[in-house]
Amino acid sequence: AESHWCYEVQAESSNYPCLVPVKWGGNCQKDRQSPINIVTTKAKVDKKLGRFFFSGYDKKQTWTVQNNGHSVMMLLENKASISGGGLPAPYQAKQLHLHWSDLPYKGSEHSLDGEHFAMEMHIVHEKEKGTSRNVKEAQDPEDEIAVLAFLVEAGTQVNEGFQPLVEALSNIPKPEMSTTMAESSLLDLLPKEEKLRHYFRYLGSLTTPTCDEKVVWTVFREPIQLHREQILAFSQKLYYDKEQTVSMKDNVRPLQQLGQRTVIKS
């Protein structure tokens, strides 16, 4: 049987054979992959990149959250959507997950001018069906998925908006465990609206196998701030394995080459 994919840290600290990032299959060896380092001064301003419109993001809900063995994932089940932001159509929210380390300098997947952040939050959306502009695009869409990526850094205050998620982590230490979060809205997790005006945009891939190259990425310039203990909770409470021997951390794909692609900014 073929080994399952994993992160480098899992291979280093477990006896189970698994495929580390350099050996990931599927589309993962192609040339339009994510994440990337964004050189902020090289990104050209594009006037078409306007503000985002968030629908359902403000609604208080009791979200299901699970440990899927790779990250912690909130199931959004089309209960929210986005439009604007230079996107070609509305996109429905599917899931939210995060990437992190146990140190402040290396938990994000994307980097800005070579700098990594403590964490990175991805809100994954799918394009509403029947909204592709032509047949070619409908068959081979490079923007079927829209991911909003938020960098996370340490601040001095507890971020109350994240507390329902952070508090739920204790209930899902092992893979395949799920729980219900205390009532919260997606908006609670985001920076204030004025901080969402500045972002970077490029076309890339999913950052986990099968690394499909059908993602329109939005990486926001302004980071979310979480308290130290909120950030550390992710690596302290969650495990990759059912035996709870390998702490979930460093679930970060290495940077990929930008190649011929361009990054634009709002």
Partner: antibody, heavy 119, light 107 residues
């Protein structure tokens, strides 16, 4: 009261290794990162690296990654730094410090360990 | 990595005078600068965090200001116990870096 107490001064031969310690008290050891900083005589401060005592995760200044190895023992609330292949350039005072915010300033410092490398 | 420049290297003052230390970063770092005092044969002591935030137990004569690339630490009435080297440190980008320090001495 938060305290970081470092091991005593050491005189060692070139080419050898040595391990210094930093015992923490007065706070939850696993909740704060421990940094190590080098200060050569009459010189400024140079950041060596950092350890998360809760997980053992480390991060090094590129300049020191082949020189220093950071470890921590949760049971004794003690952080350690091993320095290898010592030369006269390694003669310095080495401080451990607690990182006050995650990835930020050092709010409490040890008294320093003086290392002299000489034949 | 971000370079931190402190000036002047040495400051000579009389007790009771107001004194200011300058710290300049090679690129904008918001307010992520911290100031330390190191007396002879002692350990650094945190005086000011995030450019202007005071630290419990530090005398009120110490204050900080600035943002972006230019920062200042001030002592509004120098006392003899303030004789020390003063360092600034940036925590905006890894690896964190310190200035070379400014030595405060009495005239």
């Amino acid at each position: 009261d938060v305290q970081l107490v470092e091991s005593g001064a050491e005189l060692v031969r070139p080419g050898t290794s040595m391990k210094m310690s930093c015992k923490a008290s007065g706070y939850a050891f696993t909740n704060y990162l421990i940094e190590w900083i080098k200060q050569r005589p009459g010189q400024g401060l140079e950041w060596i690296g950092v350890i998360n005592p809760g997980s053992g995760g480390t991060h090094y200044n590129e300049k020191f990654k082949d020189k220093a190895t950071l470890t921590a023992d949760k049971s004794s609330s003690t952080a350690y730094m091993q320095l290898s292949s010592l030369t006269s350039d390694d003669s310095a005072v080495y401080f451990c410090a607690r990182e006050g915010d995650y990835g930020s300033r050092a709010d409490y410092w040890g008294q320093g360990t003086t290392l002299t490398v000489s034949s | 990595q971000i370079q931190i420049t402190q000036s002047p290297a040495i400051l000579s003052v009389s007790p009771g005078e107001r004194v200011s230390f300058s710290c300049r970063a090679s690129q904008s770092i918001g307010t992520r600068i911290h100031w330390y005092q190191q007396r002879t044969n002692g350990s650094p002591r945190l005086l000011i965090k995030y450019a202007s935030e005071s630290i419990s137990g530090i005398p009120s004569r110490f204050s900080g200001s600035g943002s972006g690339t230019d920062f200042t630490l001030s002592i509004n009435s120098v006392e003899s116990e303030d004789i020390a080297v003063y360092y600034c440190q940036q925590s905006n980008s890894w690896p964190t870096t310190f200035g070379a320090g400014t030595k405060l001495e009495l005239k």
